[in-house]
């Protein structure tokens, strides 16, 4: 069984199929969450919808084989089993991993820690979002790149705002969030 | 009508492993998807592990999960069941049994006993 | 996952009996995916009963399986002394798939 990976983002509709053509004169057709779950058989002619959460929200191209899942949702993160009964009685299956993830809310910048240290301005900023399993990236005059929810840095005198920018992402969304400081080491906006 | 024949049960330790295996006469055994069951002693029936007829996918109960693995070797009408860091609750009799149509099982071997026990 | 309460625990019949075994579920099995088993000491189960009504292959029609949602009932018109086993009923209308406890039906 073939094994295809897949992230979508939460609410929008999905395609489940296959790269390659089904077996020539197919039997049967089923798609199964998890094991053994039956959302969709098509045989003789006909697609028999079965009672699962999925009921009114799929379809099946018996042709392709291609299952459309509308408005799908988080609880619909599984493994997705097509299996073709073949015109010899034996079946040919392929899996498709289905990774439901939701979009990423705009972060809030925090200031955890902010103080005058010999005319230098020393920060230490936190990017929250709630609950979420993300990449953090912060972007502004830093000495480099830092991918971690916490900025820890130090300003030399300025005359200009600094502004720092959260960057949060997963696989199907980014959101950012910004922070400014006038100087000396005054909190100007966000 | 297709026959099943389960052996490879025995005493086992505490820790240790088995392999079971069911032999499979009188059906294309890679047409069917295979399921094993168990009954402890005086108990009721507990399906154990699932593998589809290409042997592409396997489920296992959570009671079972990391410790057993279910395979097959269609060339050999045989379905295995592997069986490591036994517990005395593992005791009990196993069945292989065909997984109708993903839904029911029909027909059952005989059965093995496994005694897990120091 | 569902569960499967399966009553009374035993039952205590002569032949030529009506035998009546409930089978509740702690849900709705949906569609109606119930299948019955007997099973008689030191034997394998033997599958009587699918999708709640049907009778499987070779099984005597004073077997009979009845219900929907969440209470199913199997009957056996008239006990012969065969029949004097351990029943369970087993749900696939959801993952994981469960068995109830079993009702034993003895010689009275």
């Known amino acids: 069984g073939r094994l295809v990976h897949m992230t979508v983002v939460s609410g929008s509709n999905v395609t489940l199929n296959i790269s390659e053509s089904l077996p020539e004169n197919y039997k049967q057709l089923t798609w199964f969450y998890t094991f053994d779950q039956k959302i969709v058989e098509w045989d003789s002619g006909k697609s028999k919808y079965f009672e699962s959460k999925f009921k009114g929200r799929v379809r099946l191209d018996p042709q392709s084989g291609a299952l459309y899942i509308s408005k799908v949702q988080k609880e619909d993160n599984s493994t997705y089993v097509m299996r073709v009964l073949k015109k010899d009685g034996y079946e040919q299956e392929w899996k498709i991993k289905l990774q439901v993830l939701d979009p990423v809310p705009k972060p809030v910048i925090k200031i955890e820690k902010r103080e005058d240290v010999d005319d230098n301005c020393y920060l230490k900023l936190s990017c929250v979002i709630p609950g979420e399993s993300v990449n953090y990236t912060w972007y502004g005059e830093l000495p480099k790149e830092i991918q971690n929810s916490v900025l820890e840095t130090t300003l030399k005198p300025h005359k200009h705002s600094r502004c720092y920018t959260c960057q949060v992402s997963n696989s199907v969304s980014s959101k950012n969030g910004t922070f400014c400081f006038s100087p000396p080491c005054t909190a100007a906006r966000s | 009508e297709g026959q099943l024949l389960e052996s490879g049960g025995g005493l086992a330790q505490p820790g240790g492993s088995l392999r079971l295996s069911c032999a499979a006469s009188?059906?294309?055994?890679?047409?069917?998807?295979m399921s094993w069951v168990r009954q402890a002693p005086g108990k009721g029936l507990e399906w154990v592990s699932l593998i589809s007829g290409s042997g592409g996918s396997t489920y296992h109960a959570d009671s079972v999960k990391g410790r057993f693995t279910i395979s097959r070797d269609n060339s050999k009408n045989t379905l295995y069941l592997q069986m490591n860091s036994l517990r005395a609750e593992d005791t009990a009799v196993y069945y292989c049994a065909i997984y109708n149509n993903y839904n029911w099982f029909d027909p059952w071997g005989q059965g093995t006993l496994v005694t897990v026990s120091s | 996952e569902i569960v499967l309460t399966q009553s009374p625990g035993t039952l205590s019949l002569s032949p030529g009996e009506r035998a009546t075994l409930s089978c509740r579920a702690s849900?709705?099995?949906?569609?109606?995916?119930l299948a019955w088993y007997q099973q008689k000491p030191g034997q394998a189960p033997r599958l009587l009963i699918y999708?709640?009504?049907s009778r499987a292959t070779d099984i005597p029609d004073r077997f009979s399986g009845s219900g929907s949602g969440t209470d199913f009932t199997l009957t056996i018109s008239r006990l012969e002394p065969e029949d004097f086993a351990v029943y369970y009923c087993?749900?696939?209308?959801?993952?994981?798939?469960?068995f109830g406890q079993g009702t034993k039906v003895e010689i009275k």
């Open positions: 009188g059906i294309t055994f890679g047409r069917y998807a």
């Open positions: 999708d709640a009504s």
């Open positions: 849900q709705s099995v949906s569609s109606n995916y």
């Open positions: 087993q749900q696939y209308g959801s993952s994981p798939r469960t």
